[in-house]
């Protein structure tokens, strides 16, 4: 184009559907120029214009050739351009914000601008660029991008930021500017201009103030604060440390903490101090609730639902900013809130819930809130599964007969649809406990009953019970211990019975035993024995308990000797003894020897035999009559193990085994025996009958039973060499060759000649008598030999 | 663990100068506030000056203003006090104490005697 | 300069006793005010700040309150470990001055 003529046509568009172009007017034109603008589209477009620009409808792809007339005083002149979309510029008009405001306590900033999306006739993507600055100085803090859609109408969009630093700290101010991203358009694309500025500041009051006040924060979490003062600020604090402090307008100063830890729970401490004044804040920084940990929900009474959970993680929060929780039902959408004035027992908090009629099935989500956040935890139950029955009251025992009870107790809840398992506890004194476990129906009015039996009569037991749902899900505690005596019953057995003849053979000595506690059934009173015959029977007077024997003169005819015992219900049945022996003329008195405590005694079965055995025994050197104690063992039996108290080492006992037909009889073995056998405690006593000039002839003497201290075996006699009063080494001392020793094992032995001695010579004796159960101490004596003829 | 140990106290006649250091360890020295705190045989507790965590403020008691000079070696985390023109009454027991307001931490103390 | 005084500067208590410490400031310092403990021969030992903050560590039977010019340090429950000195100390503005103490002794 020639210098003198239009030059430079530019366009630009703000919608898409109108270009904006303009031109430079020719040199040395002035102001009263025209201009016309022709087109060269389908229809050939001239416009008359005034003016250096011209608005035409956007022209659709390819090229199209312009021509600029300009008309003037001197003239005329004209230029040709070739306009094409790709020459074209997009730039948006200036956006402008409708609406910047605060919320100071969330140090949060909301925008609100319009998009005038109405003037675009595509879809179109708008990126728009938004910038925040601080200060007076508008310090860059922010520059966000924020992606729209354009959507043919006008559509008001929304922003916000949250500021690291309380805004009260210092003004903000905020800017943005948008770039239409369309896809339609090949041309140039460009941003707006930055809209005109909008700001925030907080209107102090003449306090001094601290921001933020009060805020709970997370753990780790950085932080800002600030103090907005008319005074100089010499320092802040966090607890007992110092911070830097980040100048602000004015006198306003902040610090910034990073990473900030735990909270005491009274918080922590922010100060700001000026040269006459300390200005504070406290923060709180905890953590947000855990997942409210092992929730369980279950029932006492099928009336109310008790949930428990563990908080888990503590929060370092409390007060107003503790956790809260709400328990919801999701079925029926009740609710229950947790109060924080129910403190936790034991770390583990716990919240009751209505149960609603006619609904088994439970779906309860608790919700844990607090000022960092929200969990929570959900649970499924079926409630008649979950009872855990409180412990049973009033629990009560009353007799029924002398072997049953009663239990009655008190359950606090509705279980009439449900049935109850119930462990009852039974423990006799003395010995292990009895568990019994019953079913039982579940009532609406609290009380239950239940008999048990096949108890023993005058017994004491203790009894508690416990219960739980048939379905099982937890025991209750088991109820307080009741302590019963049960009633007396008639003694199930007659008394253990033996009987003896008098020294003298006169009287008849009939012996007992106390009936065990189990067969006596009650306290014994008394007894009674009589004595029959084929012509008569006689009664004896009553013998009161604690009296175990009674004598009868009798003669030696055969009489059955009966004994019943006797407790305030009735009389037990008899125990029967014939007074005379049945004979065995086959005996022969048998050696035993016992392993410590005891004694073993065998036989061998006899079919002869058909009520029972008795062993009986006694101390072999105590007078007549021999009875110690005795013992009854079954008809069947071919053994038994004999042990007492009394049974004493060393010591000789007989034993007696009868065999028991029709209440008469047999003595079948008679034995004396030790339970140890010991070693003899003295010495034989022997004399010296004669004495030649080669030889010796010895006597001894028995040793008494007593001192024996078990069964003889034999003497350990020796002989040799030696003189009384000498320092010559004595017979038992060793080492000595010329010593001789005989073991004497016939102990009906009762002499010794020892010969091939030599004349005139003193020889020293030593006697020994021994058992199995050692060698007895040693008696001796010194012999003088005769001199040989 | 956090410990302040003070050293330089003795015997001194009135008039003459003395310098107590108070060597710090267990913390970050360089954010804390320090004080100096005396306590007179069977009396209590005066606080003598303060010193900002970077130095770059300072108090004083009136009692001890123009005497007494507080200052502080960041990179040898150790306070001192300069005490010049010492008289009897300045007998006492100086702790090092730490924190610009509350002190949550204190020496064993260093005693000084002015006498003739 | 703000004047600290306290009361009473000797006290005679038995363990297990509730002990009550005053202090007074001569103007208002709000809440800030320190206790501190000292034990013969010991230095002091930070208790309270912020008038009723429990330092870390501090058994809770030591609590405080009060705002303004009033302010207590209480004991519930007197402890043997429990017997020594207190001293208040206001921190509102330097210099920082401290209460004349309290001697707390065995009865």
């Known amino acids: 184009q020639k210098k003198g003529a239009p030059h430079d046509l530019k366009c630009v568009t703000n919608n898409l559907q109108v270009w904006d172009c303009y031109w430079k007017a020719p040199s040395g034109t002035g102001r009263g120029t025209d201009y016309e603008v022709c087109i060269e589209n389908r229809s050939h477009s001239c416009y008359q214009l005034e003016k250096t620009n011209i608005k035409i409808p956007a022209l659709s792809h390819g090229d199209y050739e312009i021509t600029i007339n300009s008309l003037h005083d001197f003239g005329s002149s004209t230029s040709k351009f070739t306009l094409n979309e790709q020459n074209v510029s997009l730039i948006p008009d200036t956006p402008e914000i409708l609406n910047l405001s605060a919320d100071f306590s969330t140090s949060t900033l909301y925008l609100k601008w319009n998009d005038r999306g109405s003037v675009f006739p595509h879809h179109s993507n708008v990126i728009w660029e938004i910038k925040i600055l601080r200060k007076e100085s508008m310090e860059l803090v922010k520059l966000v991008t924020h992606n729209t859609t354009l959507n043919g109408k006008d559509t008001l969009h929304h922003w916000s930021w949250a500021s690291d630093m309380p805004l009260e700290c210092a003004i903000h101010f905020v800017e943005i500017r948008c770039y239409i991203d369309s896809l339609h358009f090949s041309g140039r694309k460009e941003w707006s201009d930055w809209s005109p500025v909008k700001n925030i500041s907080w209107m102090p009051d003449s306090q001094t103030k601290v921001f933020p006040q009060d805020k709970v924060i997370l753990v780790g979490s950085d932080i800002t604060f600030c103090c907005i003062s008319q005074e100089k600020v010499l320092s802040a604090l966090i607890g007992h440390t110092n911070c830097p402090l980040i100048h602000l307008d004015g006198e306003n100063v902040a610090i910034k903490i990073h990473n900030i830890s735990v909270s005491a729970s009274s918080g922590t401490n922010v100060v700001f101090t000026t040269e006459d004044n300390i200005f504070g804040t406290v923060i709180f920084a905890g953590y947000p609730p855990d997942t409210p940990q092992q929730l369980n929900c279950e029932t006492h009474d099928l009336k109310e639902i008790l949930c428990r959970w563990n908080p888990g993680r503590a929060t370092a929060l409390v007060g107003p900013r503790a956790t809260s929780y709400t328990l919801l039902e999701s079925f029926s959408g009740k609710y229950v809130r947790f109060k924080r004035a129910e403190a936790p027992t034991n770390g583990s908090y716990q919240l009751f819930f209505q149960m609603l009629p006619n609904q088994e099935i439970y779906n309860f989500t608790l919700n844990a809130h607090n000022p960092l956040g929200r969990s929570e935890s959900t649970i499924l139950v079926n409630i008649t599964e979950k009872v855990y029955p409180h412990t049973p009251t009033s629990f009560k025992v009353k007799d029924i007969n002398s072997t049953a009870v009663k239990l009655s107790w008190h359950l606090p809840g509705n279980f009439a649809k449900i049935n109850f398992l119930c462990q009852i506890e039974i423990k006799k004194s003395n010995t292990v406990q009895e568990q019994r476990n019953v079913t039982i129906k579940g009532v609406e009015n609290s009380s239950y009953l239940v008999a048990l039996d096949k108890l023993n009569p005058y017994t004491v037991y203790t009894f508690r019970i416990r219960c739980s749902t048939e379905t099982f899900w937890k025991w209750s505690k088991w109820s307080n211990k009741k302590q019963h005596l049960t009633t007396e019953a008639i003694p199930s057995k007659g008394p253990d019975t033996w009987r003896e003849w008098s020294s003298d053979g006169k009287n008849l000595i009939i012996y007992w035993k106390p009936l065990p506690i189990n067969e006596a059934n009650g306290k014994i009173l008394s007894y009674n024995v009589s004595c029959s015959s084929d012509e008569e029977t006689q009664s004896l007077s009553e013998i009161p308990d604690p009296q175990h024997k009674a004598e009868i003169q009798l003669d030696k005819n055969d009489y059955i000797i009966s004994v019943v015992a006797k407790n305030s219900v009735g009389s037990s049945p008899p125990s029967k003894i014939a007074s005379m022996e049945i004979p065995n003329d086959d005996l022969k008195i048998e050696q035993v020897v016992g392993m410590g405590k005891g004694i073993l005694l065998t036989w061998h079965y006899d079919p002869n035999m058909t009520c029972d055995y008795v062993i009986k025994w006694c101390n072999s050197s105590r007078s007549e009559p021999c009875l110690m104690d005795w013992r009854k063992v079954p008809s069947n039996s071919t053994e038994t193990v004999i042990e007492s108290d009394q049974f004493r080492p060393g010591v000789r006992y007989n034993f007696f085994l009868y065999g028991c037909r029709n209440q008469g009889y047999q003595l079948l073995r008679s034995m004396i025996g030790y339970i140890e056998e010991l070693a003899p405690t003295v010495a034989p006593n022997f004399t010296v009958e004669d004495t030649s000039a080669d030889s010796i002839l010895v006597k001894w003497e028995d040793i008494p039973v007593e001192e024996l201290r078990g069964f003889l075996r034999g003497y350990l006699f020796y002989f040799g060499k030696g003189e009384r009063d000498t320092s010559k080494m004595r017979v038992l001392e060793s080492g000595r060759s010329d010593i001789k020793v005989k073991n004497i094992t016939d102990i009906s032995q009762k002499t010794l000649r020892i010969a091939d001695l030599q004349g005139k010579t003193s020889y020293h004796l030593v006697l020994r008598a021994y058992t199995d159960g050692g060698v007895g101490p040693e008696k001796s004596m010194y012999v003088v030999t005769k001199e040989n003829s | 663990q956090v410990q302040l140990v003070e050293s330089g106290g003795g015997v001194v006649q009135p008039g003459r100068s003395l310098r107590l250091s108070c060597a710090a360890s267990g913390f970050t020295f360089s954010s804390y506030g320090m004080n100096w705190v005396r306590q007179a045989p069977g009396k209590g507790l005066e606080w003598v000056a303060v010193i900002w965590f970077d130095g770059s403020i300072k108090y004083y008691a009136d009692s001890v203003k123009g005497r007494f000079t507080i200052s502080r070696d960041n990179s040898k985390n150790t306070l001192y006090l300069q005490m010049n023109s010492l008289r009897a009454e300045d007998t006492a027991i100086y702790y090092c104490?730490?924190?610009?307001?509350?002190?949550?931490?204190w020496g064993r103390g260093t005693l000084v005697t002015v006498s003739s | 300069d703000i004047q600290m005084t306290q009361s009473p500067s000797t006290l005679s208590a038995s363990v297990g006793d509730r002990v009550t410490i005053t202090c007074r400031a001569s103007?208002?310092?709000?809440?800030?005010l320190a206790w501190y403990q000292q034990k013969p021969g010991k230095a002091p030992n930070l208790l309270m700040y912020k008038a009723s903050n429990l330092e870390s560590g501090v058994p809770s039977r030591f609590s405080g309150s009060g705002s303004g010019t009033e302010f207590t340090l209480t004991i519930t429950s007197l402890q043997p470990d429990d017997f020594a000195s207190y001293y208040c100390q206001q921190y509102k503005s330097n210099p920082l001055t401290f209460g004349g103490g309290t001697k707390v002794e065995i009865k």
């Open positions: 103007q208002s310092i709000s809440s800030w």
């Open positions: 104490a730490r924190g610009q307001l509350v002190q949550d931490f």
